[in-house]
């Protein structure tokens, strides 16, 4: 039950995270014009990964796409790539994790196969989250670097445009969405990896071997005494004695001559 919950929660958290990464990638407000201490502005500039926009005081907004590919700064291209890789990995991870969900039955899929798929999707989510966090952080670093550049023709690196000294850019809403979304995807991935451990069969099942001792016939199932998770009865870790199913505690309570060699 706990494994199913962990897996389900990991899936939901990752789903929200990936939706956030997609939203952040599409958003126009990666960088917004620094308003200093003036909240009311006549012309407000903001820029995304794909286009730059201008909002006038009336609310009229005009956006222009970056129609060049070669003319864009390498850093912007790198951020785009990281975000797209994050989305692609996350989408594949979601697809894999749907089939890996314990609550969904697909044919006669073994638990080991589901465990592998859960681990795969978990790793994909982790990498996806890291890509998003890295992309947003690179962009944020670019903004911080450019913020203090106050030369007359300040090159901001957003779409290769020349800025006048009065237009400075600061963190836009998309950066915060990206950081949170990347973090959620990362957490979801970790949860999937944790769930994978619970899904995996605890030990390879060998055929039971019989050991015959005088006076007693004991069927011993190898595997040792692993720590119980505390959920359900731990039947795998019990020794079965002929003439009554006694637990390991009971055996220790009644020592026989065969316990001392």
């Amino acid at each position: 039950m706990a494994v199913t919950a962990c897996q389900g929660l990991g899936f939901v958290v990752s789903l929200i995270g990936i939706a956030g990464i997609i939203a952040a990638t599409c958003m126009d407000q990666w960088s917004t014009q620094d308003l200093y201490n003036n909240p009311v502005t006549a012309v407000f500039n903001y820029q995304g990964l794909w286009r730059s926009c201008v909002r006038e005081s009336s609310g009229f907004t005009e956006c222009r796409g970056y129609f060049t590919l070669l003319g864009l700064p390498a850093m912007l291209q790198a951020v785009r790539a990281l975000m797209i890789v994050g989305i692609v990995l996350g989408a594949i991870g979601l697809l894999v994790s749907i089939f890996a969900l314990k609550c969904i039955r697909i044919g006669s899929m073994e638990d080991s196969a589901k465990a592998n798929m859960t681990l795969t999707s978990g790793i994909m989510f982790i990498v996806s989250g890291l890509c998003a966090i890295a992309g947003v952080s690179v962009f944020a670093n670019m903004l911080v670097t450019n913020f203090w550049m106050s030369t007359a023709n300040m090159y901001t690196g957003m779409g290769g445009m020349v800025q006048t000294v009065q237009t400075r850019y600061t963190f836009g809403a998309a950066l915060f969405v990206g950081w949170v979304a990347g973090g959620l995807t990362l957490i979801g991935g970790v949860m999937m990896c944790i769930a994978c451990r619970g899904l995996a069969p605890e030990e390879t099942n060998y055929k039971a071997v019989s050991y015959h001792a005088s006076g007693h016939s004991v069927a011993y199932k190898p595997g040792g005494f692993k720590a119980s998770t505390g959920f359900g009865s731990n039947t795998k870790n019990k020794k079965i004695y002929d003439g009554g199913a006694r637990t390991e505690d009971e055996v220790q309570s009644y020592p026989s001559k065969h316990d001392y060699v």
Epitope: N38, V40, T41, A42, V43, N45, Q47, S52, C53, V54, E56, S57, S58, G59, F60, E62, R64, M161, V162, Q163, T164, Q166, T167
Partner: antibody
Framework: EVQLQQSGTVLARPGTSVKMSCKAS????????MHWVKQRPGQGLEWIGA????????TYTQKFKGKARLTAVTSASTAYMELSSLTNEDSAVYYC????????????WGQGTSVTVSS | DIVMTQSPSSLTVTAGEKVTMSCKSS????????????LTWYQQKPGQPPKLLIY???TRESGVPDRFTGSGSGTDFTLTISSVQAEDLAVYSC?????????FGAGTKLELK
């Protein structure tokens, strides 16, 4: 048709206050900025400030902070400007003008309210 | 604040003549985000409120005759009337529409000979 109807001529004593109105019609009052502009006889235009009735945003030029107070009553589609501590320098024609949707321009103007400050 | 300087302060012309007037701003009015110049031109006839002629430095307001042309970029702007008519006699003012507080030029008065 967009119309801005301003209140009539005002004669005031120095040190007093006046409140003029600008009644808007023919458009959604809450969706545009309302600008106020001063023009002294034989002189150029001087921007006082503007307010956005839909968001209660107001901005003034430094010179008129404390002198002019811009308000609006959305239910009546009317903008107001109150001028306090009047001096002879405040004698002018005051225009209200609607902020255009494009270019931060002022596309429709009221006929103006003439204020004369005299003792 | 951005200071707007207009020249000449007055112009005496004959009907049918081509007229140009200048407007200079103390700071660039070019917005890099959309490559538009936030400069507006108004016409004010005696005893009347101003009338919007041109916004974004070169875009004519609807209903404005095409003899009025706005040009320029950055800090230097020009209003040209290709063939002056009697009804064009007025004061022409330019306005910074780029940043608050909005500021106007002193105006150029167009008079007939």
């Amino acid at each position: 048709e967009v119309q801005l109807q301003q209140s009539g001529t005002v004669l005031a004593r120095p040190g007093t206050s006046v409140k003029m109105s600008c009644k808007a019609s023919g458009y959604r009052f809450t969706s545009s900025w309302m600008h106020w502009v001063k023009q002294r006889p034989g002189q150029g235009l001087e921007w006082i400030g503007a307010n956005y009735p839909g968001k209660s945003d107001t901005t003034y030029t430094q010179k008129f902070k404390g002198k002019a107070r811009l308000t609006a009553v959305t239910s009546a589609s009317t903008a107001y400007m109150e001028l306090s501590s009047l001096t002879n320098e405040d004698s002018a024609v005051y225009y209200c003008a609607r902020g255009a949707y494009y270019g931060n321009a002022m596309d429709y103007w009221g006929q103006g309210t003439s204020v004369t400050v005299s003792s | 604040d951005i200071v707007m300087t207009q020249s000449p302060s007055s112009l005496t012309v004959t009907a049918g003549e081509k007229v140009t007037m200048s407007c200079k701003s103390s700071q660039s009015l070019l917005n890099s985000g959309n490559q538009k110049n936030y400069l507006t031109w108004y016409q004010q006839k005696p005893g009347q409120p101003p009338k919007l002629l041109i916004y974004w430095a070169s875009t004519r307001e609807s209903g404005v005759p095409d003899r009025f042309t706005g040009s320029g970029s950055g800090t230097d702007f020009t209003l040209t009337i290709s063939s002056v008519q009697a009804e064009d006699l007025a004061v022409y003012s330019c306005q910074n529409a780029y940043s608050y507080p909005f500021t106007f030029g002193a105006g150029t008065k167009l008079e007939l000979k």
